[in-house]
């Protein structure tokens, strides 16, 4: 290499990370295997759980403003869960990103998109509930499923907008031991006249902005909304929290517990640019808190189940119905089975408190799922406990 060939500029913290070498220590190998197993399990659980929640809430329940929020939260979590297998692969091949720069950018962007979308959606849920209690007349006139979807669309757009810097500044960096990192490289685009200044300002800007926009502001909105609702309900002499309140409380608590440590370490990492003494702490802690943040997407569906009475039973029944429907489809490929298929479907619908989303004459299987994804899923009003919990407007 010629003396004038400038090497890829890296911020000091990133260059030092690239110098860290892997050890083939037995206990470290054991921890790595356990991590791969844990993340693999989380990947599977996350995909299945969020897929089920999307199906049940989106296809088998009366669509309300509340189910709209839950639907979008589950969609965000499903996206994050879908990216987890690739993170598991990264761990499995010895903490090396072997999937290329473009996929590194995309994978990381999904993580941050979920971070922003979760924060924004939880804020919207809290504000929605606040408006219901504080401005009931306005809510009665303006709270529609269509409006909720529009709000969600705006929130997704904001989340995408906030994710752009993380897509731009994500890069693959070769370590000196041959492994590849998929990490921030804030000098990737227009490093400016002074690299030190750029490293400090950009890393701090990213850390502080994500802490504020994806964590502190949402939690402040949630807290103030909760305070406003509590005050109003106290005046009305209402004491017992509604089902949806319990669900929101659980999801918000999980959000704070799972994302809080990540933001703490992210801010520490920004400080570590000027304070190298913090770097070892960040290097050790960041992988753990990042995984914890990922696991929030796996925890949410569990919380939906635990905080809604009889949810587990309804889910079980609902899944059995789906299974029966699929089995009937497979066994009656001939034209003669259509009447029995119709009869089975109607029986299934009456048997399940969570009635099927599609009508007997509608397409089945993948076509039906596609139809729902494209918005053609006709939902009929239900009265099951889960639905009451999710569509409760009084609490």
């Amino acid at each position: 290499m010629s003396a004038n060939a400038t090497l890829k500029p890296l911020c000091p913290i990133l260059e030092q990370m690239s110098r860290l070498q892997s050890h083939s220590n037995t206990s470290i190998r054991y921890i790595d295997h356990a991590a791969v197993l844990l993340h693999g399990l989380a990947s599977l659980l996350g995909l299945v759980e969020n897929g089920v929640i999307l199906f049940v809430v989106g296809c088998r329940m009366r669509q309300t403003v509340v189910t709209t929020w839950v639907l979008h939260l589950a969609l965000s979590d499903l996206l994050a869960s879908a990216s987890l297998p690739f993170f598991t692969y990264f761990l499995a091949v010895g903490h090396s990103w072997e999937l290329g720069t473009t996929f590194c950018k995309l994978h990381s962007s999904i993580f941050f998109l979920n971070m922003f979308a979760s924060g924004f959606l939880l804020s919207a849920i809290s504000l929605d509930r606040c408006l219901q209690v504080v401005r009931p007349v306005w809510a009665q006139n303006h709270r529609t499923v269509a409006a909720a979807h529009k709000v969600c669309l705006v929130l997704w757009a904001l989340a995408v907008l906030n994710t752009v810097p993380y897509f731009v500044f994500r890069d693959t960096i070769s370590r000196l031991d041959g492994r590849i990192m998929c990490y921030y490289n804030v000098l990737l685009l227009n490093p400016g006249p002074d690299r030190d200044a750029t490293c400090n300002s950009r890393q701090a800007a990213l850390a502080v902005s994500k802490f504020l926009l994806a964590f502190l502001v949402p939690l402040a909105i949630i807290a103030s909304s909760h305070a406003a609702v509590s005050l109003r309900l106290q005046h009305r002499g209402r004491r017992r929290p509604g089902r949806f309140v319990r669900l929101v409380a659980a999801v918000v608590a999980a959000f704070a517990l799972c994302w809080g440590p990540y933001h703490v370490f992210s801010l520490l990492e920004a400080r570590a640019h000027a304070n190298p003494g913090l770097r070892p702490l960040v290097w050790r802690g960041l992988p753990f808190v990042t995984s914890l943040a990922f696991f929030n997407s796996v925890a949410n569906p569990v919380l939906y189940v635990l905080t809604c009475p009889d949810m587990l039973r309804k889910l079980r029944r609902s899944l059995r119905t789906v299974l029966e429907s699929v089995l009937v489809d497979d066994s009656e490929l001939g034209g003669a089975g259509s009447s029995r298929r119709r009869r089975t479907s109607s029986t299934a619908r009456s048997a399940s408190p969570l009635a099927l989303c599609s009508r007997p004459e509608e397409p089945r299987g993948p076509a039906r799922l596609l139809g729902w994804l494209l918005g053609s899923c006709a939902a009929s009003p239900q009265t099951g406990p889960l639905n009451r919990a999710l569509s409760s407007t009084s609490s």
């Epitope: 500029p9 002074d194 030190d196």
Partner: antibody, heavy 118, light 107 residues
Amino acid sequence: EVQLVESGGGLVQPGGSLRLSCAASGFTFSSYLMSWVRQAPGKGLEWVARISNGGSTTDYPGTVEGRFTISRDNSKNTLYLQMNSLRAEDTAVYYCARHRTNWDFDYWGQGTLVTVSS
Amino acid sequence: DIQMTQSPSSLSASVGDRVTITCRASENIYYNLAWYQQKPGKAPKLVVYAATQLADGVPSRFSGSGSGTDYTLTISSLQPEDFATYYCQHFWITPWTFGQGTKVEIK
């Protein structure tokens, strides 16, 4: 070919001042961090100062902090070391060095001798 | 400040010998270590950076190893041009300090 040429050394009295220069050529000066390193006669090496590629960040060891100031003029491809309140223990050959990346001095000048004596 | 202790301070060896110089830091420096070679009246020359990486143009008989606080520079087969003083330097937390040097002399 990378070249670093120091100048400005000489004999100075204790408490006096001196300004060292380092003319750089053969590479894009504004892309590299730079440092000054000194070596007392018959002794080991001591890092003295460091400056970021744009000049916004500087670092010094406690032995020279407050007395020495590192600066650069990227338009002139020149690095400077302003030395004030000089002491006898500052007597050394002063080298300017280019950083390979954020660290590791990959190119050094031939050095300039600074003697602090009354 | 991080102290860098080099050993031995001097050694006598013959051409073709295997030479090992060690450098111990007073705390973990996370591979942020460089080795320099200096000949009398000349400026130092970078030999190894990041503890294990050979600098451009340095012969493969030189190698660096180590982790944590203990690092080593090895010359597998000493050549006449390798007789010089070798310094280690850490780049972890400022001030970046050097070892006191190891003088490799002809036996």
